[in-house]
């Protein structure tokens, strides 16, 4: 799609024919439906200069008008060589995906002085992109806001109404503001400066592929990778795969490696597939049954027949006409094509192209190196194709940039700055000194010397939005596919050995022994009415109260001699006063001074794929929720067994918490999910679990001083 909306009409659609082979190794093919523009460089420059504020009126067209002064302005603003010419560096910049906010001037004249006059900023996520799981989107936005709150006095609170200061919306084309998006690439997002109504709002082009900057995010199920996302591309049997594959399996289930190399790392999971589960419908998430009969016809794949909305569905029994049971087929982000002449269809592997078979996306036949696939099994006869998903754009980075605008920042001319208009993927710290100086010019620095994450008090929505689809129920273990592409992986380490004998020694005091200097605790638990914090063989006790400080450190070995130095999680069962200590694949249960264990997690009904228990929450009388990575189970304390049918995914029960928490604990009737030095606090009201605060464990729970 063209970067410049007014030029949509001059796109050239190429016919369905092959080009004469060029004198080079691979044949170049003209793909039907491939959109190319016949824009001259000058036309492109005129549109760009006007759209982004370098020329005042759209009529500044025609060869007679010199673009020199405007080009100089642009080159100065974007820190390009100031030639005043339409040179290759300038053209390259003009073709780079970017923010839609003009560099000079604004969308329009706004009222007010374009900063917020209160520091507790609220935001509402009005809708979602389907490119990423909702929890990942929530997290990306929370982290983007946290960048700005870390360097200013601002806090960011998620709310559930359009009364929010900042409304976040995914939209396509004309999406309700008079500044239409332009299809894939080009213009990625835009935001308005602070103020009422549309002012302060941030809009993201949903024709982009939103990711975390490194390819589509495909969460896996089962396998041995604990729900980790696919890693694209990955190596399997020496070949590179850029999408989920059924290679190496006889059951047709698509899978992927969750690391770059399956051959060396052996980590994998199953990709969303209608052969694994369906969504919504009326069949309780059961997988598709192929073939199935619908209106007397046989179907061996998901279909949109019988529906006007284009949703793919299938029957979950052999005969829909008789049983009327169906579900919707999960979307396969890894192999849903974009552009071409089959947008939205799935790649079909293997497919035949120029007589050769391909079981992964290819750039053969193209001169631009872009990966593509056929959407039927034979491109040569059907000519149906589309582009394979690319790296996508980091929602976190683009959001952080747009939120800068929503707080009142203009574009920066420093190429390394977050507020530079062009998209640039980086895994380093996003904020540049220029960004920090700009935002502090508006709001001043944080009163505390130490940066802190946002406080996100989440008020109850007046009517909770329907989350559709909420996702299928977890597949019962007996229905699970076999463990891996080439058989079950060998069992991982059984966990650390128990600590050797120890004598009761006083711990020599050093700065490390102050709980306030501990960055990340191994485990935290409420025992009795105190909070216990464990780290490297030591623990502290903390009682809430004005001016109270954590007491300790004490040696774990003095109080619980059987335990190892490193704990993953701890909890107290209130009725029996039993203490459960988890480390690796082992658990110890203390009742007073007597200990049972170490016992393997298998004894609790947790399979070999559960490497550790990362936390626990109370869940009714004598019941707990046990967490491991992205999964959780219901645990009967008396029976000391998990209910295998209760397995669920954390982000379904606790939307908005990070996906990679290392500790989950309960304190004062609220749930805390720890990631790095931060916690996400969840309160449960009328059966809705909602993040109501994000903070530092040390400053906000332990009340540590911030100097």
């Amino acid at each position: 799609m063209s970067l410049w909306q007014p030029l949509v009409l001059v796109l050239l659609v190429l016919g369905c024919c092959f080009a004469a082979p060029r004198q080079r190794q691979s044949t170049l093919v003209l793909f039907p439906g491939d959109l190319r523009t016949n824009l001259t460089d000058r036309q492109l420059a005129e549109e760009y200069l006007y759209r982004y504020g370098y020329t005042r009126v759209a009529e500044m067209r025609g060869e007679s008008k010199s673009l020199g002064p405007a080009l100089l302005l642009l080159q100065k603003q974007l820190s390009l060589p100031e030639t005043g010419e339409l040179d290759s560096a300038t053209l390259k910049a003009m073709r780079t995906p970017r923010c839609g906010v003009p560099d000079l001037g604004r969308f329009q004249t706004f009222e007010g002085d374009l900063k917020w006059h209160h520091h507790n900023i609220t935001y509402w996520i009005q809708n979602y992109s389907e490119d990423l799981p909702r929890a990942v989107i929530d997290d990306a936005f929370a982290r983007a806001f946290a960048l700005w709150s870390a360097v200013t006095p601002l806090t960011f609170t998620r709310v559930y109404s359009r009364d929010a200061d900042i409304v976040i919306q995914f939209g396509v084309a004309e999406h309700g503001d008079g500044y239409p998006f332009d299809g894939k690439d080009g213009l990625l997002a835009h935001a308005f400066p602070p103020g009422p109504g549309i002012q302060g709002d941030a809009h993201f082009d949903d024709d982009e592929l939103w990711s975390l900057g490194k390819g589509v995010v495909v969460p896996t199920r089962f396998g041995n990778a604990d729900g980790a996302a696919c890693h694209f591309p990955f190596i399997f049997e020496g070949r590179s795969y850029s999408a989920c594959t059924t290679d190496g399996r006889s059951d047709g289930l698509p899978w992927c490696s969750t690391t770059a190399n399956y051959d060396t790392d052996d980590r994998f999971g199953f990709c969303p597939s209608e052969r694994l589960y369906t969504q919504d419908g009326n069949a309780d998430g059961k997988p598709c049954q192929f073939p199935f009969i619908f209106q007397g016809q046989s179907y061996s794949a998901c279909t949109t027949d019988g529906r006007s909305d284009g949703y793919r569905w299938c029957a979950t029994t052999a005969n829909y006409d008789r049983d009327k049971l169906f579900g919707f087929c999960p979307t396969r982000a890894d192999s849903t094509v974009m552009g071409g002449n089959s947008a939205g269809e799935l790649c079909v592997f293997p497919f035949t192209f120029l007589g050769k078979e391909y079981s992964t996306c290819t750039s053969e036949g193209r001169g631009d190196g872009r990966l593509w696939c056929a959407t039927t099994s034979n491109f040569d006869s059907d000519k149906k194709w589309g582009f394979c998903p690319d790296q996508g754009y980091s929602l976190f980075l683009v959001a952080a940039h747009e939120f800068g605008h929503a707080l009142g920042l203009d574009h920066s001319s420093v190429p390394e700055a977050l507020m530079y208009p062009m998209y640039r993927f980086t895994e380093g710290p996003p904020l540049h000194k220029d960004d920090v100086n700009g935002i502090r010019h508006l709001y001043g620095p944080r009163p505390e010397p130490e940066p802190r994450p946002p406080t996100t008090t989440t008020p109850q929505p007046t009517a909770p939005p329907t989350v559709c689809p909420t996702g299928p129920p977890t597949v019962h273990p007996s229905e699970r596919p076999t463990a891996g592409p080439t058989g079950p992986p060998s069992a991982g380490p059984t966990g650390p050995p128990t600590a050797g004998p120890s004598t009761a020694t006083t711990v020599p005091l050093s700065p490390v022994d102050d709980a306030c200097n501990v960055n990340i605790f191994d485990a935290i638990a409420e025992i009795g009415n105190q909070l216990y914090l464990f780290k490297d063989g030591k623990y502290w006790r903390f009682s809430e109260g004005r001016g109270s400080r954590p007491q300790g450190p004490f040696l774990i070995a003095d109080k619980w001699p059987a335990l190892p130095r490193k704990l993953d999680s701890v909890f107290e069962e209130r009725l029996s006063k039993k203490l459960f200590f988890f480390s690796g694949r082992q658990v110890w249960v203390y009742t007073g001074a007597s200990v049972l264990g170490p016992r393997r997690l298998d004894k609790l009904g947790l399979g070999a794929d559960v490497a550790q228990v990362t936390g626990a929450l109370r869940s009714g009388r004598g019941k707990m929720l046990l967490f491991s990575g992205r999964r959780l189970w219901r645990f009967d304390v008396k029976a000391q067994m998990v209910d295998p049918r209760s397995a669920s995914e954390v982000d379904r029960m606790f939307p908005g918490v990070p996906l990679d928490t290392h500790d989950v604990f309960q304190y004062r009737e609220k749930a805390y999910f720890c990631q790095d030095r931060f916690y996400w606090r969840v309160s449960s009201r009328s059966e809705l679990n909602q993040v109501d605060q994000v903070g530092y464990v040390t400053y906000d729970i332990l009340q540590c001083p911030e100097d």
């Epitope: 500044y179 109504g197 002012q199 909305d309 939005p465």
Partner: antibody, heavy 115, light 107 residues
Framework: QVQLKESGPGLVAPSQSLSITCTVS????????VHWVRQPPGKGLEWLGV???????NYNSALMSRLSISKDDSKSQVFLKMNSLQTDDTAIYYC?????????WGQGTSVTVSS | DIVMTQSHKFMSTSVGDRVSITCKAS??????VAWYQQKTGQSPKLLIY???YRNTGVPDRFTGSGSGTDFTFTISSVQAEDLAVYFC?????????FGGGTKLEIK
């Protein structure tokens, strides 16, 4: 508080043009889009068009050739102009503020097309 | 243009009853549906926006749900003052379009 008020001619002869002014208070046209909607007697609501904060417009495709919407931000006024009126253009014409739904409406101005 | 279809032109109900009005979009409009109430001789009033969010000051007996193409507006316990015509509207893509309306009659 937020208010919108339409003022129009009431009676228009067939083939003539219609001009309605929507005067707003309590909010800025720089922060909210304004939509026009009409309702023929005893019938449903028909969306006519919108003018967004920056002045761009979108129209009902069936009426696009006859419709024009403009505004004067400083006077807080939005204008609807419609050409070549016929009897089936008889309706109550409303302007409404938009922000994820039309949250404030004018009381409407009744337009009768008759000779 | 997207067509919004309200299958029932009229619905009859009694005070205290639960009533649901449905609206179907001719193509996916995500969650961008609003519901309006219009009483005789009055301008329409926004009740629900973005499919499921109640507008400020709207009683909690009014709820909305749905996403994609199928949307439902529900009054959990009908009151006499709920006698009105209810319209759905999509604001996903211009031209924005309304459903034909459902007139709620109280027995």
């Amino acid at each position: 508080q937020v208010q919108l008020k339409e003022s129009g001619p009431g009676l228009v002869a067939p083939s003539q043009s219609l001009s309605i002014t929507c005067t707003v208070s309590g909010f800025s046209l720089l922060s909210y889009g304004v939509h026009w909607v009409r309702q023929p007697p005893g019938k449903g609501l028909e969306w006519l068009g919108v003018i967004w904060t920056g002045g761009t417009t979108n129209y009902n495709s069936a009426l696009m050739s006859r419709l024009s919407i403009s505004k004067d931000d400083s006077k807080s006024q939005v204008f609807l102009k419609m050409n070549s009126l016929q009897t089936d253009d008889t309706a109550i014409y409303y302007c409404a503020r938009y922000y994820y739904g039309m949250d404030y409406w004018g009381q409407g101005t009744s337009v009768t097309v008759s000779s | 243009d997207i067509v919004m279809t309200q299958s029932h032109k009229f619905m009859s109900t009694s005070v205290g009853d639960r009533v649901s009005i449905t609206c179907k979009a001719s193509q996916d409009v995500r969650n961008t549906v609003a519901w309006y109430q219009q009483k005789t001789g009055q301008s329409p009033k926004l009740l629900i926006y973005s499919s499921s969010y109640r507008n400020t000051g709207v009683p909690d007996r009014f709820t909305g749900s749905g996403s994609g193409t199928d949307f439902t507006f529900t009054i959990s316990s009908v009151q006499a003052e709920d006698l009105a015509v209810y319209f759905c509207q999509q604001h996903y893509i211009t031209p924005y379009t309304f459903g034909g309306g459902t007139k709620l009659e109280i027995k």
